[in-house]
């Protein structure tokens, strides 16, 4: 049986949409599956490595990888998204191509990033963990780690840095996939809100459906003991 | 407001060093991502960058002058330093002072200057 | 090192003129940054990122150009313009300006 909710929800583009949830319904009239899930039901993805779910994340990762910033050209906020899913006329998309991106660091000016921009997150303003020395950050925005402190400027003159961001990843359905979402649509359909993170790739949506005890690598299920809980 | 002054010797002869001081206000050396630079103006010519320190002490030099040269930092009294060791009387100039900015830019800048010191390098 | 041939070295605008001076890099660069220094004064920031205006820089000042050839503009010329205007740029060590460009009042 399934369990159908409606309800007008803000979505990335700053409108209301009415967005259905579907929940599944438990046949005997107990836990949802999240729930079991948690509690420590014999879920295989959290055993061991799933080939479908490994296959959806590599995916995310790589359209993730050629995503900008979409500034709102009204200043009513930025969302990390793909070049086609931002207005050509109400926004900006912020993408750094053909020279347009930073230097890698201090030390090497002649080579230019070509993955970003993100929303809200940038190497030149991240003083925690800072991109210098042997620590520079990739230029592969998927690899980034999460900025924990910015630096305390008001205003940095960068675009996709001075907008009010708008949506941030959501860990949605026992699939463990991702998506950048507004807080509300991502409560809505019962996901977990990384308020901390800018990009999908730098959370671990299966550590979070699984529960328990995190896993020693967090892109590899290794909850065995799973075998004896239930 | 952002303001630096450059403080040297003024005159000195040949063969000695050239210590130049940076006085800054306005601003912090210990802030991320902030620089102070040097660059030279012989009189009538064009400028020449000799060096910039960053907030992480990371220090560049001028490739041609570098063996020569000694950039440091006093972020407790918001100060830079500079030294030039065996001056030539071809390096008489007028030294600036500079903050690096990157407000909106890709790059950096040289954006706020100081009023520079004239040194005379004479026998 | 990127060596940064400004041209003309001298001209001369009368007031309201159009003026326009180059900055042609012996190699390739990014961006390129412009400064203002008017007699008895220190350099002052004009232009980064070739062609963003600096804070308080007033809008007749423009800036153009990519690769190896880069352009400054005045718009109208006005007597207190009357400087010398030398272009930088950030993209390899060592940092190197040009000559300069005199801007003489007619």
């Known amino acids: 049986a399934q369990h159908v909710t409606t309800q007008l929800v803000l979505r990335n583009k700053g409108v209301y949409e009415s967005v259905k949830y579907i929940q599944q319904e438990n046949f005997w009239i107990g836990p949802s599956s999240i729930d079991l899930i948690h509690l420590g039901a014999k879920f295989s993805p959290c055993i061991r490595k799933d080939q479908q779910i490994e296959q959806l994340v590599l995916r995310e990762r790589d359209l993730e990888r050629d995503s900008g910033c979409c500034v709102q050209n009204d200043h009513s906020g930025c969302i990390q998204t793909q070049r086609k899913d931002c207005s050509e006329t109400l926004a900006t998309f912020v993408k750094w191509q053909d020279d347009t991106g930073p230097p890698m660091d201090k030390s090497d000016l002649g080579q230019k990033r070509t993955s970003g921009a993100v929303c809200h997150q940038d190497p030149r303003t991240c003083e925690e963990p800072a991109s210098s020395g042997a620590h520079i950050w990739p230029d592969d925005i998927t690899k980034w780690p999460i900025c924990t402190e910015q630096a305390k400027s008001n205003r940095t003159g960068f675009l996709h840095m001075d907008c009010q961001i708008k949506g941030r990843p959501c860990c949605i359905s026992t699939k463990g996939s991702c998506e950048i979402t507004t807080r509300e649509y991502c409560e809505f359909m019962h996901g977990y809100f990384h308020e901390e993170a800018t990009l999908c790739s730098q959370v671990h949506c299966l550590d979070k459906v699984c529960g328990l005890l995190p896993f020693l690598n967090p892109e590899v299920p290794d909850q065995f003991y799973r075998l004896w809980l239930s | 407001q952002v303001t630096l002054k450059e403080s040297g010797p003024g005159i000195l002869q040949p063969s000695q060093t050239l210590s130049l001081t940076c006085s800054f206000s306005g601003f912090s050396l210990s802030t991320f991502g902030m620089g102070v630079g040097w660059i030279r103006q012989p009189s009538e010519k064009g400028l020449e960058w000799l060096a910039h320190?960053?907030?992480?002490?990371?220090?560049y030099y001028n490739p041609a002058l570098k063996s020569r040269l000694t950039i440091s930092k006093d972020t407790s009294k918001n100060q830079i330093f500079l030294k030039i060791t065996n001056v030539d009387t071809a390096e008489t100039a007028t030294y600036y002072c500079s903050r690096i900015g990157n407000y909106g830019s890709n790059y950096w800048y040289f954006d706020v200057w100081g009023t520079g010191t004239t040194v005379t390098v004479s026998s | 090192q990127i060596v940064l041939t400004q041209s003309p070295a001298v001209m001369s605008a009368s007031p309201g003129e159009k003026v326009t001076m180059t900055c042609t890099a012996s190699s390739s660069v990014y961006y390129m940054y412009w400064y203002q220094q008017t007699p008895g004064s220190s350099p002052r920031l004009l232009i980064y990122?070739?062609?963003n205006l600096a804070s308080g820089v007033p809008v007749r000042f423009s800036g153009s150009g990519s690769g190896t050839s880069y352009s400054l503009t005045i718009s109208r010329m006005e007597a207190e313009d009357a400087a010398t205007y030398y272009c930088q740029q950030w993209n390899t060590y060592p940092l190197t300006f040009g000559a300069g460009t005199k801007l003489e009042l007619k």
């Open positions: 990122d070739t062609s």
């Open positions: 320190i960053w907030w992480d002490d990371d220090k």
